[in-house]
Amino acid sequence: KSPIFGPQEVSSIEGDSVSITCYYPDTSVNRHTRKYWCRQGASGMCTTLISSNGYLSKEYSGRANLINFPENNTFVINIEQLTQDDTGSYKCGLGTSNRGLSFDVSLEVSQVPELPSDTHVYTKDIGRNVTIECPFKRENAPSKKSLCKKTNQSCELVIDSTEKVNPSYIGRAKLFMKGTDLTVFYVNISHLTHNDAGLYICQAGEGPSADKKNVDLQVLAPEPELLYKDLRSSVTFECDLGREVANEAKYLCRMNKETCDVIINTLGKRDPDFEGRILITPKDDNGRFSVLITGLRKEDAGHYQCGAHSSGLPQEGWPIQTWQLFVNEESTIPNRRSVVKGVTGGSVAIACPYNPKESSSLKYWCRWEGDGNGHCPVLVGTQAQVQEEYEGRLALFDQPGNGTYTVILNQLTTEDAGFYWCLTNGDSRWRTTIELQVAEATREPNLEVTPQNATAVLGETFTVSCHYPCKFYSQEKYWCKWSNKGCHILPSHDEGARQSSVSCDQSSQLVSMTLNPVSKEDEGWYWCGVKQGQTYGETTAIYIAVEERTRGSSHVNPTDANARAKVALEEEVVDSSISEKENKAIPNPGPFANEREIQNVGDQAQENRASGDAGSADGQSRSSSSKHHHHHH
């Protein structure tokens, strides 16, 4: 399918001009390649009439131009002084030959309709109203006033001043005069439909002295606005129907042969195909509203219409606005998983794409809620603090310049299942939808923190360990301190080159974090997680409470009482014969207890276990301490 898009049908009248916009995919090659407009002949050949290379055919000389707008990925063909000879089939396209990527456009140029010379033309959109002005001479002031619509031979009454109204105009037609002006009467017709188009005669008086005026009423269907969007991107239909319908129910529907199927309305109706990816915005002070659809699919392409009616359904004679949506399958939006699966108690890391040209834009994550018109309250953002109910379990990691930011949600429950949107304050096309599915956990989590009830004592040393399985062996492990502005990764050091492990004991991989000395500011949520480069993986969370030391409890005297909490991170391979209790029985801060850093000892622990006294807890702490010592000298 060609990714070029434009108007399928263009109509105009002789002497007028047209402007035809054609869209192309956003690539450097497309922006610079030749653009053309050609006319299709009976033989299937397409003869160039104008191109961006400067070619202009004889029949277009002095009346046409082609302008490329690379910043919008569009080009426009303007043709003036149209004649009926311009009616025909055309192509707008890209490429060095006219057999390149193209879109078929049908142009129809009609004759100017012949109207009586004194005819007043009113041009109105479907659903709107018209007020026809009917002047008359003072002597006809007492006479009957009327408006009739011309049919083949007769003129069928619409309304007159004796309050006679044609049944098809009841409730829609009003005849009135303004103030004390006795030389003009007016007829207002509301909720105009195609059937109302035609010639009318307004009349005051009877016989040869009557005042008559010819009126031509044209009722137009709105010209569809063309929308060219990428697969997986988002679209916003901005609907401005006017203040007169500000308080009516609103809808968006998609044309399906003769009917228009409602996709969403403000009365709570929503097409299941759009579950999780559509919402109606609150209407503004003038009754304008928008419909947002994210995660565009190729089957979303088509003809859309928005409107207003108390039923929330399309109704003849009510104002509408229309769009033709084209979904370009050559998308710039990366193809990411649209469904992410997690388990209760576990975590998910969701990679959200954004336009890489907008790395400084604000990033957000919101949860789609289907009640009412659908809405998507922001849960976390670059500047937006995490919503209270997500405290300790939600964070956004921005990776500038990479075209991706990551949202991590842990401590999952089945309540978290649903639809979430990734969005930025930049290019709105990059709004994407993720469905999160949460199943009941059937096994132990991959990451486990001990001790699970963590209460640290002020001024003392406190260590928590995060156990991970062998499959995470080669990944980077980290601890971070959570706040409602994100999860700040605690700095760590790798000591020496990583040694490859010959065997991996499932029960023995752990990464520890030590707070030394514990301060009140250390209280809060901490996450242990794994990542590979900028790709975040699983996380688990623990809340560390800090309490005052009770009398008689042991403590380690810090050498610098003003120092903030010491954080030491050790990655160890512990002999499985040593119990967790033994391993952590003697907290030995080592000679650098006050240094503010995380110590990531890496896989060297394997060596140390072989040479040190792995059989005693004391030996274990000494080897740990000597590693610290070795690192700093």
């Epitope: 915005t281 503004d284 809405h375 309250p377 922001v378 670059t382 930025t424």
Partner: nanobody, 122 residues
Framework: EVQLVESGGGSVQAGGSLRLSCAAS????????MGWFRQAPGKEREFVAG????????YSADSVKGRFTISRDNAKNTVYLQMNSLKPEDTAVYYC???????????????WGQGTQVTVSS
């Protein structure tokens, strides 16, 4: 970062008018929907009026509809709140806020000003 500075607050008699201004600096102003919020003593901060990035759409709380008008000048990086027919219950600290997401997803405010006091006496 976006820095927001409000001005134009003051004291006025009931029925009077005031025009608040909020000057923005830092990031691209037109990338943000702008809003005015207010907080009366002992009450929660409440939304007063908002305006879309382009200025094409405005939103007002029911309590100020027809009396307060929000507008913006993207060339001057400024948003205004014209307050007419002021009532004693309009007394509050008025805050200007910038939000990256327009109104489609609920206006929360990513950046906030320090506020300007408006006092309406009867």
């Amino acid at each position: 970062e976006v820095q927001l500075v409000e001005s134009g607050g003051g004291s006025v008699q009931a029925g009077g008018s005031l025009r608040l201004s909020c000057a923005a600096s830092g990031r691209t102003f037109s990338n943000y929907a702008m809003g005015w919020f207010r907080q009366a003593p002992g009450k929660e901060r409440e939304f007063v009026a908002g305006i879309s990035r382009s200025g094409g759409s405005t939103y007002s709380a029911d309590s100020v509809k027809g009396r307060f008008t929000i507008s913006r000048d993207n060339a001057k990086n400024t948003v205004y709140l014209q307050m007419n027919s002021l009532k004693p219950e309009d007394t509050a600290v008025y805050y200007c806020a910038a939000d990256g997401l327009d109104y489609a997803l609920g206006f929360r405010g990513d950046y906030w000003g320090q506020g300007t006091q408006v006092t309406v006496s009867s």
